[in-house]
């Protein structure tokens, strides 16, 4: 069961896995959740009754029964990992800790104007896990305004001490706020021969890359495939680092693959969720249980529902045996990866899906797209919403996109003349406008947040957020779309679609069925040539055919320009403005979402 509250003055006895240092019990709980085996923890707060060397210790614990005996102890705070919970989990920690010095390897020291600037520096430095900043009031003159960037093997401090007039905090890479490049390429027949920080077994290079991404010290990796000549190294995943942050040594070697940590793009790709099945593959590890199951899918469900199960191997039933049920071996290891991977024994293996909730919901695969045609089918664009106004009568006003369970991203110009959020209704999971009746459920709007630099669509900043009164429960027909990564600024999107219920020509009416059109992106230089009377800024993005014919139009405003990249859909643009609709040499102009990621995160993550 999911227990979220913390137990004050309580200590769990026994079950210790390891001890780390965290600045708060709340963060100790996050560290426990992300640890492959931790189910419970005990944190020691700062207290006069407690030995200062034990302050801020976070003891990670495991138990076969999923609980441990409780003992009363002043200053101890205990709790359970969120592994047992079904809600979305994030490692993002924006808290600033006053008068705490988080110890680590101080590898970079520089002057910064503020703690925020120091945190930004840490977020944009490939090695930085956390920082300590000496404020203006720091007693030692030569240390004032000094920003120390730090890292450790675990990503958590090696110790935490009280120190007046300093503040500490963590890198915001896991909050999607890093400007570091996101290099998704996997390089075949390549070995990176830099320092290894760890090695694990993985079934393929993609899993190896995901493990690298959530390993605190891994910057890039090399994976030896199952065809690697040296049998003892097949399926070996080497997690690597270097001083420069880039591989210094690339060696051509067949059957090896190498790539980079996806830390800077982890909010828009699955990192923890290894959802594939590996046929004719056996994962070895500590056996948790052996149960009968009808299929490998059923075995994966059993593993996902068993909180301690990390991976499994399913051996299909021999004909007519055991009512056609095979054996499902539920397994675990110290690091969450198989201790060995064997091929050719007929097993089907995979991982728990319990960790998928640590990834952004937007990375979930949606059903295959219908090619051709202009009308969409149900569930094809599950992030698309229709925004209605009820004044003076109810009608479709604009499109919008679900980007979080309480947030819709749309265009600012949609709210011209809208006096109050009370007159707005957001309908999700809708294909046809005719489905919307008096009793159709909708989301009320609590708040309209328009970019404060917005004046008119043509001059940019045409972006707005709607905070919903209630949260969206994600289903196949209503789920979020990923925001583009700041590290993906140089990606060339080739599979982009504009969707909406808008006009099909300049003088028309709102369409009943959600329409879709595949539209190529146009460079800003090319777009500027087509709109000489306007300034096409880098905060805008253009799309359209030279000959015209396909475009967004009236009523599509605020809706998404959705682009598929590496199997994940990204909200690249918001339908904003254009000269007419689908005119020759007049591309549509969209708000360039990647340029507003900071603004979106600032508004949606505000406490």
């Amino acid at each position: 069961e999911c227990v979220t509250q913390l137990l004050k003055d309580t200590c769990f006895e026994g079950g210790d896995i390891t001890t780390v240092f965290t600045p708060s019990a709340k963060y100790c709980q996050v560290v426990c959740t992300y640890h492959p085996r931790c189910l419970l923890f005990t944190f020691t707060a700062e207290s006069p009754s407690e030995d200062p060397t034990r302050w801020f210790t976070c003891v990670l614990k495991d138990s076969v029964t999923e609980t441990l005996p409780r003992v009363n102890r002043t200053a101890a705070i205990s709790g359970y990992s969120f592994k047992q919970c079904s809600h979305q989990i994030s490692a993002c920690n924006k808290d600033i800790y006053v008068d705490l010095d988080m110890k680590g390897i101080n590898y970079n020291s520089s002057v910064a104007k503020s703690a925020q600037e120091c945190q930004e520096r840490c977020t944009d430095d490939v090695h930085c896990h956390f920082f300590t900043y000496a404020t203006r009031q720091f007693p030692s003159l030569e240390h004032r305004n000094i920003c120390l960037l730090k890292h450790t093997q675990t990503g958590t401090p090696t110790r935490i001490t009280k120190l007046d007039k300093v503040v500490s905090g963590f890198s915001l890479k896991s909050c999607a706020l890093s400007n570091l490049a996101c290099i998704r390429d996997i390089f075949p027949n390549t070995v990176f021969a830099d320092s290894n920080i760890d090695s694990v077994m993985a079934p393929d290079a993609f899993v190896c890359g995901r493990i690298c991404t959530h390993h605190p010290g891994c910057l890039f990796f090399t994976f030896f495939s199952q065809e690697w000549p040296k049998e003892s190294q097949r399926n070996l995943c080497l997690l690597k680092t270097s001083e420069s942050g880039l591989p210094s040594t690339r060696i051509k070697k067949s059957k090896a693959l190498s790539g980079f940590s996806l830390q800077s793009c982890r909010h828009s790709i699955p990192v923890f969720c290894h959802s594939s099945f590996y046929h004719d593959t056996d994962f070895l590890g500590e056996e948790l249980d052996i149960v009968a199951a009808k299929s490998h899918e059923a075995c994966q469900k059993l593993c996902t529902n068993a909180v301690r199960c990390q991976f499994f191997t399913y051996t299909p039933a021999q004909a007519s045996c055991n009512e056609g049920k095979g054996k499902c071996y539920l397994k675990l290891s110290s690091n969450g990866s198989p201790t060995k991977i064997l091929h050719g024994r007929g097993g089907i293996s995979g991982y728990t899906l319990r960790l998928c909730k640590m990834d952004n919901e937007c990375t979930t695969k949606i059903k295959p797209r219908i090619v051709g045609g202009t009308a969409s089918v149900r569930g094809e664009w599950p992030w698309q919403v229709t925004l209605h106004t009820t004044s003076p009568t109810q009608r479709h006003l604009c499109g919008g996109s679900i980007i979080g369970n309480q947030w819709i991203l749309t265009a600012a110009h949609c709210f011209y003349g809208v006096e109050s959020p009370k007159i707005l209704r957001v309908y999700s999971g809708i294909l046809n406008q005719s489905e919307i009746k008096e009793d159709t459920s909708f989301f009320g709007v609590q708040e309209i947040i328009i970019h404060d630099q917005y004046k008119m669509a043509e001059s940019g900043y045409d972006i707005a957020l709607l905070k919903l009164e209630t949260t969206v429960n994600y289903t196949d027909s209503q789920r979020p779309i990923c925001l583009p990564s700041k590290g993906d600024r140089n990606v060339i999107y080739t599979d982009c679609w504009v969707t909406g219920w808008g006009y099909r020509k300049l003088r028309d009416k709102i369409q009943n069925t959600l329409q879709k059109a595949k539209i190529p992106l146009v460079t800003n230089e090319e777009c500027q040539k087509r709109y000489r009377g306007h300034k096409i800024t880098h905060k805008m993005i253009c799309a359209g055919y030279r000959e015209g014919g396909k475009d967004a139009c009236k009523g599509d405003s605020g809706g998404p320009l959705s682009c598929k990249h590496n199997e994940v859909w990204h909200l690249v643009g918001i339908t904003s403005w254009g000269e007419g609709c689908a005119q020759r040499e007049r591309p549509g102009v969209y708000t360039n979402v990647v340029e507003y990621v900071d603004w979106i995160l600032e508004k949606t993550q505000a406490v």
Epitope: V191, F192, A193, D194, S195, N196, I197, S199, T222, P229, K230, S232, Q233, L236, L238, K240, T249, I251, K252, K253
Partner: nanobody, 126 residues
Framework: QVQLVESGGGLVQPGGSLRLSCTAS????????MAWYRQAPGNECELVST???????YYADSVKGRFTISRDNSKNTLYLQMNSLKPEDTAVYYC????????????????????WGQGTLVTVSS
């Protein structure tokens, strides 16, 4: 028990030459990718040169044009010919088999299937 035994280290003057050898036993030498690493006092372990099982070679920028790696599969031996030696080449030189990168900057810890020799000291000094 896999064994890698280095020899040929010693004291040499700047500009001088040395030839290091590494004799391997208890594994299939010709199928292995071999390498020389070095570790100077207080420094991290660094890759000097690699020769793959199919004869492909790699050299660190700092030794390019001065060092030559070679192997004699019939003798299960790896060589490193070091010319124009400089004081900054002073280090313990380690022979390694199927070891793609050092672990934690240390020339002794390996991952599955990777092996290290015990090292031979090269001192370049006048």
């Amino acid at each position: 028990q896999v064994q890698l035994v280095e020899s040929g280290g010693g004291l040499v003057q700047p500009g001088g030459s040395l030839r290091l050898s590494c004799t391997a036993s208890e594994f299939t030498f010709d199928d292995s990718d071999m390498a020389w690493y070095r570790q100077a006092p207080g420094n991290e372990c660094e890759l000097v040169s690699t020769i793959t099982s199919d004869g492909g070679t790699y050299y660190a920028d700092s030794v390019k044009g001065r060092f030559t790696i070679s192997r004699d599969n019939s003798k299960n031996t790896l060589y490193l010919q070091m010319n124009s030696l400089k004081p900054e080449d002073t280090a313990v030189y380690y022979c390694a088999a199927d070891q793609w990168g050092s672990a934690e900057g240390d020339c002794t810890s390996s991952y599955p299937g990777g092996y290290w020799g015990q090292g031979t000291l090269v001192t370049v000094s006048s």
